[in-house]
Amino acid sequence: MAVTACQGLGFVVSLIGIAGIIAATCMDQWSTQDLYNNPVTAVFNYQGLWRSCVRESSGFTECRGYFTLLGLPAMLQAVRALMIVGIVLGAIGLLVSIFALKCIRIGSMEDSAKANMTLTSGIMFIVSGLCAIAGVSVFANMLVTNFWMSTANMYTGMGGMVQTVQTRYTFGAALFVGWVAGGLTLIGGVMMCIACRGLAPEETNYKAVSYHASGHSVAYKPGGFKASTGFGSNTKNKKIYDGGARTEDEVQSYPSKHDYV
């Protein structure tokens, strides 16, 4: 039950995270005009990964796409790439994790296969989250660098008389959405990996054999040995618990596959 809950929760958290990464990637407010300590203008500028927008006080908003590919800064291209990789990996991870969910029965899929798929999707979610966090962080670093550069020459004098105000940009809402979404995807991925450990078959169970020692009649059941943690391990001799009741011999200190949270 705990494994199913962990896996389900990991899936849901990752789903929310990936939805957030997609939202952040599409959002226009990656960088917004810094209003602090700036002359009050009737125009508000903000920029995304794909287009830049201008909102006028009168109520009109105009957005222009970046129709060039080669003319864009390499850092922006890198951020785009990281976000897209994050989305693609996350989407594949979601697809894989759907089939890996313990609560969903697909034919006669064995636990080892589900464990494999859970681990795969977990790793994909982790990498997806890291890509998003990295992308957002690279963009944020770029903003910070540009911010202080533009602060250094906030006003560029023209002939000593006329002043040109340089627009400074600060963190937009998309950065925070991206960080949170990346974090959630990462957490979801970790949860999937934890769930995978619980899904993996942990015991190789042999049929009970009676050994007759001289003078004693003791039945010895070698049931407490752990199976290999390799995902392709034999699962044909699975122990079937009836209502969780165990014989005295079966009570052991080793964790069973139901003990992982």
Partner: antibody
């Protein structure tokens, strides 16, 4: 079609408060801003202030302490209140709709306000 | 506040001639976000409210004759009437629509010779 109509008292005593209402039609105050401009007889235009779609306001810095602009979206009305009037406030007061580039694309006919005792 | 300076204060031209008036702002009205200049030109005929001619320094308002054109960028702007007509007799105002508070120039009066 877009229309703006100012309604004012015409004559106001010095030190009193002027209240002008601009009733608009043909557009919504939740979508577009309204700006106020005045013109003393025989002189140039002076921007007074504006109330934007979201309800935020901006004022002429020289008149800020005396000016209040508010609106009632449901009644499609914008009001301008100016306190402590002097003879220098005698002017035609216009309201205008904000358009592209923050320009005023539609204007009311204006209302003449005379400050005199 | 931004100071808008218009020149000349009055301009007399013959019908059919070209009229050019200037407007200078104390700060650049160019917005880097969309590369547009937030300068507006208005025409005010005697006894009438002002009428919008040009916004974004060079974009003609719909219904405005194409003999009116705006140019310039940053701090220096020009309104040109390619062939003056009798109905163009008016005062022309430029306005800063970028920095609050918005400010008008003192106006250029166009007269017919």
């Amino acid at each position: 079609q877009v229309q703006l109509k100012e309604s004012g008292p015409g004559l106001v005593a010095p030190s009193e408060t002027l209240s002008i209402t601009c009733t608009v039609s043909g557009f919504s105050l939740t979508t577009y801003g309204v700006q106020w401009v005045r013109q003393p007889p025989g002189k140039g235009l002076e921007w007074l202030g504006a109330i934007w779609a979201g309800g935020n306001t901006n004022y002429n810095s020289a008149l800020m302490s005396r000016l209040t602009i508010s609106k009632d979206n449901s009644k499609s009305q914008v009001s301008l209140k100016m306190s402590s009037l002097t003879a220098a406030d005698t002017a035609i007061y216009y309201c205008a709709k904000g358009g592209y580039g923050n320009a005023m694309d539609y204007w009311g006919q204006g209302t003449l306000v005379t400050v005199s005792s | 506040d931004i100071v808008m300076t218009q020149s000349p204060s009055s301009l007399a031209v013959s019908l059919g001639e070209r009229a050019t008036m200037n407007c200078k702002s104390s700060q650049s009205l160019l917005n880097s976000g969309n590369q547009k200049n937030y300068l507006t030109w208005y025409q005010q005929k005697p006894g009438q409210p002002p009428k919008l001619l040009i916004y974004w320094a060079s974009t003609r308002e719909s219904g405005v004759p194409d003999r009116f054109s705006g140019s310039g960028s940053g701090t220096d702007f020009t309104l040109t009437i390619s062939s003056v007509q009798a109905e163009d007799l008016a005062v022309y105002y430029c306005q800063n629509d970028y920095f609050f508070p918005f400010t008008f120039g003192q106006g250029t009066k166009l007269e017919i010779k």
